[in-house]
């Protein structure tokens, strides 16, 4: 494995192979597994791709899918930071319209306090 450490796909890896890339990451990085057909290769990332958040675990940090409804990017399992087009962000969740007492800020698609 060590012979592949200079390979760009092995950046940030603790364990790496030519065929599958990283399988374990350095402490502060997040593991992400790219699947292509029936093959896969791991990467160690400083931040997770859109649609995933950084999940910290005892053995290894990993990127995990954002499962908040209508959310594009999230900070954690239950806190959205960017909603899908057509939805408004309010307190970490996505709504098709802002709750009472909040108005949509069109440029950021966020709900802010104030009159409609």
């Amino acid at each position: 494995r060590a012979s592949y450490v200079s390979n760009p796909i092995c950046k940030g890896c603790l364990s790496c192979s030519k065929d599958n890339g990283c399988s374990r990451c350095q402490q502060k990085l997040f593991f992400f597994l790219r699947r292509e057909g029936m093959r896969q290769y791991g990467e160690c990332l400083h931040s997770c791709p859109s649609g995933y958040y950084g999940h910290r675990a005892p053995d290894m940090n990993r990127c995990a899918r954002c499962r908040i409804e209508n959310c594009d990017s999230c900070f954690s399992k239950d806190f959205c930071t960017k909603c899908k087009v057509g939805f408004y962000l309010h307190r970490g969740r996505c709504f098709d319209e802002c709750p009472d007492g909040f108005a949509p800020l069109e440029e950021t698609m966020e709900c802010v306090e104030g009159c409609e």
């Epitope: 192979s17 992400f32 597994l33 999940h55 675990a57 053995d59 290894m60 995990a64 899918r65």
Partner: antibody, heavy 125, light 107 residues
Amino acid sequence: EVQLVESGGGLVKPGGSLRLSCAASGFTFSSYAMSWVRQAPGKGLEWVSSISSGGSTYYPDSVKGRFTISRDNAKNSLYLQMNSLRAEDTAVYYCARGGDPGVYNGDYEDAMDYWGQGTTVTVSS
Amino acid sequence: DIQMTQSPSSLSASVGDRVTITCKASQDVSSAVAWYQQKPGKAPKLLIYWASTRHTGVPSRFSGSGSGTDFTLTISSVQAEDFATYYCQQHYSTPWTFGQGTKVEIK
């Protein structure tokens, strides 16, 4: 509450066919990958097939070309069409949520997080 | 295909004992290992995924650890309802493969 209920098992002769069904409820069926796993009498678990939420299908070599997995999102149902059955296909067949080989989730859906009670398939002459 | 080898194949324990089951993968599977519990005549239940993450509703006495090729499921203080067969599974690359199972019996 997530519920998976299999049906369609039975006794079939070698070379015969059978179609298993799995009725899903308690979750947004169309959003999840689904899998079939079998267990021969007194043996361990063996993965049989998976289908992604988008309809991509995956099989191990042992059933490739003989079994076909499919889904009907409108009916919240998963199916397994089994052709050219052999004695070694005798098992309890479980429907399970998750296990998509085509997508990385980094969470519970990479494993198989909920299972049905199983349906028994016996292949014998 | 990746082989998953569990040990022991069976063990006897008393209520309150600490139980450890190991699973060895034939090649590096990162942390992509799940553990399931199965009782006779019942469907398997997911306990742990990604080596150490407990599934919803799983008691804290169940814990998983490991990465690469060596993985462990630990029951810190086994209860009467924990006597069952346990399977590991790698969810790193297809075909998904399971260990042969470890039966935990009452001493």
